[in-house]
Interface confidence: medium
């Protein structure tokens, strides 16, 4: 899922398989002057960042799971 | 919708009514050593930050709308 870089988007391509347990936070960025695309940037527990495909049902599931996360997790 | 920038929970209270068009980005933070709660922090286009209730169906709708956002918006 390659993303056009000409508008200074931060996501050059997106990662397919990512496990929710490895995610520390997910930032959903609306389109703006820097980029005409919606961008989803996950920060992993090891400090790395990865771009996710906003159109992916898996990404929507991951975010939904995070929102409904049991506090004891 | 107070936000505290510490290595603890950042959200002291959550804001109820917020319009997606005012949101620049939404950060969903999983529970971790800094905070036992899932936190949802919206950065507004005016630079302000607002904490949203992760359990709110409205918040889930807002994020879903952002993920499915038409690029021309």
């Amino acid at each position: 899922a390659s993303v056009v870089t000409e508008l200074r988007c931060q996501c050059l391509q997106t990662l397919q398989g990512i496990h929710p347990k490895n995610i520390q936070s997910v930032n959903v960025k609306a389109p703006g002057p820097h980029c005409a695309e919606t961008e989803v940037i996950a920060t992993l527990k090891n400090g790395q960042k990865a771009c996710l495909n906003p159109a992916s049902p898996m990404v929507q599931k991951i975010i939904k799971k995070m929102l409904n996360c049991d506090k004891s997790n | 919708a107070s936000v505290v920038t510490e290595l603890r929970c950042q959200c002291l209270q959550t804001l109820q009514g917020i319009h997606p068009k005012n949101i620049q980005s939404v950060n969903v933070k999983a529970p971790g050593p800094h905070c036992a709660e899932t936190e949802v922090i919206a950065t507004l286009k005016n630079g302000q930050k607002a904490c949203l209730n992760p359990a709110s169906p409205m918040v889930q709708k807002i994020i879903k709308k952002m993920l499915n956002c038409d690029k021309s918006n």
Partner: antibody, heavy 125, light 107 residues
């Protein structure tokens, strides 16, 4: 070793032209955006222009728009800044900078992580 | 254009001190902000990227924080080599803009 080397600076009269070059080595030049940044004597940093990796998109500060042209030759690993209609206020040290900052293959943060040593441009009669 | 305002513009401190430099954006820039250090006669050097991430090889006494409009660069236990000028820079949108700089001098 990753390196940027500017050349082409010098003394020019107001209204004149100069072409700055920046030779890159040690990285895949065509993959990364590049910028020119200048610094007038005793002043702060001012971004001048940027160009995408392919050269397909260019960006300019308002102060140089219509007078300066950024370009690149990826086959020669070289970045250029063509400066026309030069003014006294264009006097500065000009730096080229790589807009690196790719974390893994999946995230790009456009940081100017490698800079040249700078080339001085003096516009004076 | 997004304006970046740094404060203070100059600062005197001693070796071992903890210093804080702030940078404010005229509109929200998410975490799209970098910090650079420049010594006289030298090119700038990247210290912090994306507001809070330490560039490789930069000592851990440097740290950054903030997002949205307000950002901070902190230097813990100042060393002699830290006396320099510091700049913030936003990359949220072009034109890219730098703060006016903060000159850190020895007291």
């Amino acid at each position: 070793e990753v390196q940027l080397l500017e050349s082409g600076g010098g003394l020019v009269q107001p209204g004149g032209s100069l072409r700055l070059s920046c030779a890159a080595s040690g990285f895949t030049f065509s993959e990364l955006s590049m910028s020119w940044v200048r610094q007038a004597p005793g002043k702060g940093l001012e971004w001048v222009s940027a160009i995408s990796g392919s050269g397909g998109s260019t960006y300019y500060a308002d102060s140089v728009k219509g007078r300066f042209t950024i370009s690149r030759d990826n086959s020669k690993n070289t970045l250029y800044l063509q400066m026309n209609s030069l003014r006294a206020e264009d006097t500065a040290v000009y730096y080229c900078a790589r807009e690196g900052g790719r974390l893994e293959p999946y995230y790009y943060y456009y940081a100017m992580d490698v800079w040249g040593q700078g080339t001085p441009v003096t516009v004076s009669s | 254009d997004i304006q970046m305002t740094q404060s203070p513009s100059s600062l005197s401190a001693s070796v071992g001190d903890r210093v804080t430099i702030t940078c404010r954006a005229s509109q929200s820039i998410s975490d799209n902000l970098h910090w650079y250090q420049q010594k006289p006669g030298k090119a700038p050097k990247l210290l912090i990227y994306d507001a809070s991430n330490l560039e490789s090889g930069v000592p851990s006494r440097f740290s950054g924080s903030g997002s949205g409009t307000d950002f901070t660069l902190t230097i813990n236990s100042l060393q002699p080599e830290d006396f320099a000028t510091y700049y913030c820079q936003q990359y949220y949108s072009t034109p890219l803009t730098f703060g006016q700089g903060t000159k850190l001098e020895i007291k």
